[in-house]
Interface confidence: low
């Protein structure tokens, strides 16, 4: 039975040209995290594998940095980066947990960096 829950940074906004940290946190389970996939709609951004470490998709290598933790940092944001992002936790023995983040990249300086939780 899957007892875990994923907390995410929820709906966030950032300024064009800036950077943003996407974070998810899996709680309420003792399952072992074997891999975390970060995806944008149907595109793979990055993988953090417990044994192999990070792999960043070639299309994003210039703009994506691993971390902090299992999170992902997006840099040099463009308006085209607006959309849904998913953190997909592969765990044993529970299976797969998915969290959703919506990022809006704004042209002006009115972006508010909202976050539902902080990871120190």
């Amino acid at each position: 039975m899957m007892t875990g829950t994923i907390e995410t940074t929820g709906n966030i906004s950032a300024e064009k040209g800036g950077s943003i940290i996407l974070q998810c946190h899996l709680s309420s389970t003792t399952a072992q995290v074997t891999q975390v996939n970060w995806e944008q709609q149907d595109q793979l951004l990055a993988i953090c594998n417990a044994d192999l470490g990070w792999h960043i998709s070639p299309s994003f290598k210039d703009r994506v940095a691993p971390g902090p933790g299992l999170g992902l940092t997006l840099q040099s944001l463009t308006v085209n980066d607006t959309g849904e992002y998913f953190c997909i936790y592969h765990t044993y023995p529970d299976g797969t947990y998915t969290g959703r983040i919506f990022l809006e990249v704004l042209e002006s300086s009115v972006a508010e960096h909202g976050a539902r939780f902080q990871i120190p």
């Epitope: 990070w54 792999h55 070639p58 940095a65 691993p66 971390g67 902090p68």
Partner: antibody, heavy 116, light 107 residues
Amino acid sequence: QVQLQQPGAELVKPGASVKMSCKASGYTFTTFWINWVKQRPGQGLEWIGDIFPGRGITNYNGKFKNKATLTLDTSSSTAYMQLSSLTSEDSAVYYCSRGLGYFDVWGAGTTVTVSS
Amino acid sequence: DILLTQSPAILSVSPGERVSFSCRASQSIGTSIQWYQQRTNGSPRLLIKYGSESISGIPSRFSGSGSGTDFTLSINSVESEDSADYYCQQSYRWPYTFGGGSKLEIK
């Protein structure tokens, strides 16, 4: 000017270890991955692994997982690679290079000779 | 691991000619291919990234094309200084791998 500086040569005995350096200058060390590449005399290039100075994350080519250890000294903007249990097969030029996926800056290489 | 096969192994041409090197991947890798030049006793130098993207400071006679499994590096009007080994390298999946290289000799 962006540079990666490596010592020219290391002579080591079979069974010993060697630790070579790669000193970065001209850019922010913690924002670019450092890769290590092996080239045996007259042969092609082999990727050993990479390390991200911003977080110390490493990735290894499975072939070198028990041979190479990648470390950092961020205070001096220097990356290190230690090779253990050396044999004649480890005699090669070892390059460090900068980048994730593509390698835009290369050191001059360290020639490691394993000989008794 | 992804295998990259380069051809020809050796190419001998006269200055001013156009040359092409081939790199074939063992599986589809999109455009995740780089090309490097390595002169005798020198370090590799990045020529092309992601299949066809040019690199600052590299002469415009160097160009790359291809996607999927088949890639080409072309040199339009070869110069004597282009005498070197040329390697392709994939960044689609760890471990990154290089092709076996192609040697360009200038007559």
